[in-house]
């Protein structure tokens, strides 16, 4: 039988980004991150 | 709200065409993923699907009676038609439309109309 | 076509108890997109079907929770947990992932 036509079953999901800067002393210099979703991936 | 309503005539003769319409409200054919779908159920039986039309145009059979239906849409008019050509006493059914909206949560046919009974009968 | 079978054909139940009816499909009903198309129905005396449970477990808007679906593959259930005098009626499985979509024969509630 051929498949009724449906979308692809991926659902959207919306996350805020959060870009972030931290000052960790100035002999260590700074840490920049990328937060989505409350985890930090880069 | 969202409503669909069958239309058509009560009795027709042995060879002839059956024309059906759906008219509905409270939402568009001209929406990404929408669809109307046409099932009939003979009494006392079961559900029998017999089509289905997209709002891109894209429309699906039941193959056991392809050669015998054509489904079509006016969007402007919010309604969509059935024919069903070679009517038979068999044919005689309670005919539905319903709506199914495949880019959304409830892929499903939510939304059904009051049906109409076709009478199949020289 | 796939065919949709469905037991019992007729289910007398008493108020406040609880209902199970199993619809098998004759083949797979995943869909290559990922989900099943595995739905109920509701054809109280009179009227048009309405939806119940679509996707295999997930009510509709405005069914009452004593109302739930589970299965996979080719075994499904519905379940309800306390029957009520209002869900009376024929209850209709259906999939909706192939060409045609096929329907269950049925399953008659009656209140004893």
């Known amino acids: 039988d051929a498949e009724f036509r449906h979308d692809s079953g991926y659902e959207v999901h919306h996350q805020k980004l959060v870009f972030f800067a931290e000052d960790v002393g100035s002999n260590k210099g700074a840490i920049i991150g990328l937060m989505v979703g409350g985890v930090v991936i880069a | 709200q969202v409503t669909l309503k069958e239309s058509g005539p009560a009795l027709v003769k042995p060879t002839q065409t059956l024309t059906l319409t759906c008219t509905f409200s409270?939402?568009?054919?001209?929406?990404?993923?929408?669809?109307v779908s046409w099932i009939r159920q003979p009494p006392g039986k079961a559900l029998e699907w017999l089509a289905h039309?997209?709002?891109?145009?894209?429309?699906l059979y039941n193959p056991s009676l392809k050669s015998r239906l054509t489904i079509s849409k006016d969007t402007s008019k919010n309604q969509v038609v059935l024919t069903m050509t070679n009517m038979d006493p068999v044919d005689t059914a309670t005919y539905y439309c319903?709506?199914?909206?495949?880019?959304?949560?409830?892929?499903?046919?939510?939304?059904w109309g009051q049906g109409t009974t076709v009478t199949v009968s020289s | 076509d796939i065919v949709m079978t469905q037991t019992p054909l007729s289910l007398p139940v008493t108020p406040g108890e609880p209902a199970s009816i199993s619809c098998r499909s004759s083949?797979?009903?995943?869909?290559?997109?990922?989900?099943?198309?595995l739905e109920w129905y509701l054809q109280k005396p009179g009227q048009s079907p309405q939806l119940l449970i679509y996707?295999?477990?997930n009510r509709f808007s405005g069914v009452p929770d004593r109302f739930s679906g589970s299965g996979s593959g080719t075994d499904f259930t519905l379940k309800i947990s306390r029957v009520e005098a209002e869900d009376v009626g024929v209850y209709y499985c259906?999939?909706?992932?192939?060409?045609?979509?096929?329907f269950g024969g049925g399953t008659k509630v009656e209140i004893k």
């Open positions: 409270g939402f568009s054919l001209s929406t990404s993923g929408m669809g």
């Open positions: 259906c999939q909706g992932s192939r060409v045609p979509p096929t």
């Open positions: 083949q797979s009903i995943v869909h290559s997109n990922g989900n099943t198309y």
């Open positions: 319903a709506r199914r909206r495949i880019i959304t949560v409830v892929d499903a046919m939510d939304y």
């Open positions: 039309i997209y709002w891109d145009d894209v429309s």
């Open positions: 996707k295999v477990s």
